[in-house]
Amino acid sequence: EQAPGTAPCSRGSSWSADLDKCMDCASCRARPHSDFCLGCAAAPPAPFRLLWP
């Protein structure tokens, strides 16, 4: 759950308690079981860009 009083995440992103920040739903491609991915199921993700470390 997002901490009370914090701004909601922008469209195409979802709150991660594991990371304590909003995460881009496109990241669910890498790790579909990330905690924030549940919040992404309701809204379509932002356009995905392949990123390399």
């Epitope: 308690a17 594991d18 990371l19 304590d20 995460m23 881009d24 990241s27 669910c28 491609r29 890498a30 790790r31 579909p32 079981h33 990330s34 392949l50 990123l51 390399w52 470390p53």
Partner: antibody, heavy 120, light 112 residues
Framework: QVQLVQSGAEVKKPGASVKISCKVS????????IAWVKQAPGKGLEWIGE????????YYSEKFRGKATLTADKSTSTAYMELSSLRSEDTAVYYC?????????????WGQGTTVTVSS | DIVMTQSPLSLPVTPGEPASISCRSS???????????LYWYLQKPGQSPQLLIY???NLASGVPDRFSSSGSGTDFTLKISRVEAEDVGVYYC?????????FGGGTKVEIK
């Protein structure tokens, strides 16, 4: 470049504890998960658990819950795994591995491994 | 937990010849996104595991294109088109669909 450097080999007596470290460099420590994997002599790979270094949140394999404790020190970019109540079956090489949250592939960097030997 | 089963246990190979390793998962690794969360790792003698293939068919950075992988939701094959001496080691399949992260038992590839 990305590096995960683990602490040296340990020899412990049954019942003792051991704490091994994994110092990372070349990337932002809090941006990736650190997983720990066991490889017993002549055996395969077994996931122990993983930690989000930024928040300290952990996930464990049921098998290792109560055996392993994962922690992280953001100030030194170091992850730790403590193994308690050591038995002979804990003799193994233990690896830390960086697991991605952001990219399309996963587990792309591993430490060199730490050998733990439990012997009386 | 998802069980990953590999075969064969051991694979003697001739340099220059093709080789293939099979992996089966106890649950489909095909996600609703269309991505199949199957990974292949190689552990060379005395080394840490290294990623070869991610999401069933994508070569990791620096991996030669003689390696390829294909499959369905539960049955997968890693192919080496022409085995080289440097390809020896233990190959592991793994999934990244959910926790726990599980690996196959490994296939040891050795030169005949």
């Amino acid at each position: 470049q990305v590096q995960l450097v683990q602490s040296g080999a340990e020899v412990k007596k049954p019942g003792a504890s051991v704490k091994i470290s994994c110092k990372v460099s070349g990337y932002t420590f809090t941006d990736f998960i650190i997983a720990w994997v066991k490889q017993a002599p002549g055996k395969g790979l077994e996931w122990i658990g993983e930690i989000y270094p930024g928040t300290g949140r952990t996930y464990y394999s049921e098998k290792f819950r109560g055996k392993a404790t994962l922690t992280a020190d953001k100030s030194t970019s170091t992850a730790y795994m403590e193994l308690s109540s050591l038995r002979s079956e804990d003799t193994a090489v233990y690896y830390c591995a960086r697991r991605t949250i952001y990219y399309d592939y996963d587990g792309d960097y591993w430490g060199q491994g730490t050998t733990v030997t439990v012997s009386s | 937990d998802i069980v990953m089963t590999q075969s064969p246990l051991s694979l003697p190979v001739t340099p220059g010849e093709p080789a293939s390793i099979s992996c089966r998962s106890s649950k489909s690794l095909l996600h609703s996104s269309g991505i199949t969360y199957l990974y292949w790792y190689l552990q060379k003698p005395g080394q840490s595991p290294q990623l070869l293939i991610y999401q069933m068919s994508n070569l990791a950075s620096g991996v030669p294109d003689r390696f390829s992988s294909s499959g369905s939701g539960t049955d997968f094959t890693l192919k080496i088109s022409r085995v080289e001496a440097e390809d020896v080691g233990v190959y592991y399949c793994a999934h990244n669909l959910e926790l726990p992260w599980t690996f196959g038992g490994g296939t040891k590839v050795e030169i005949k």
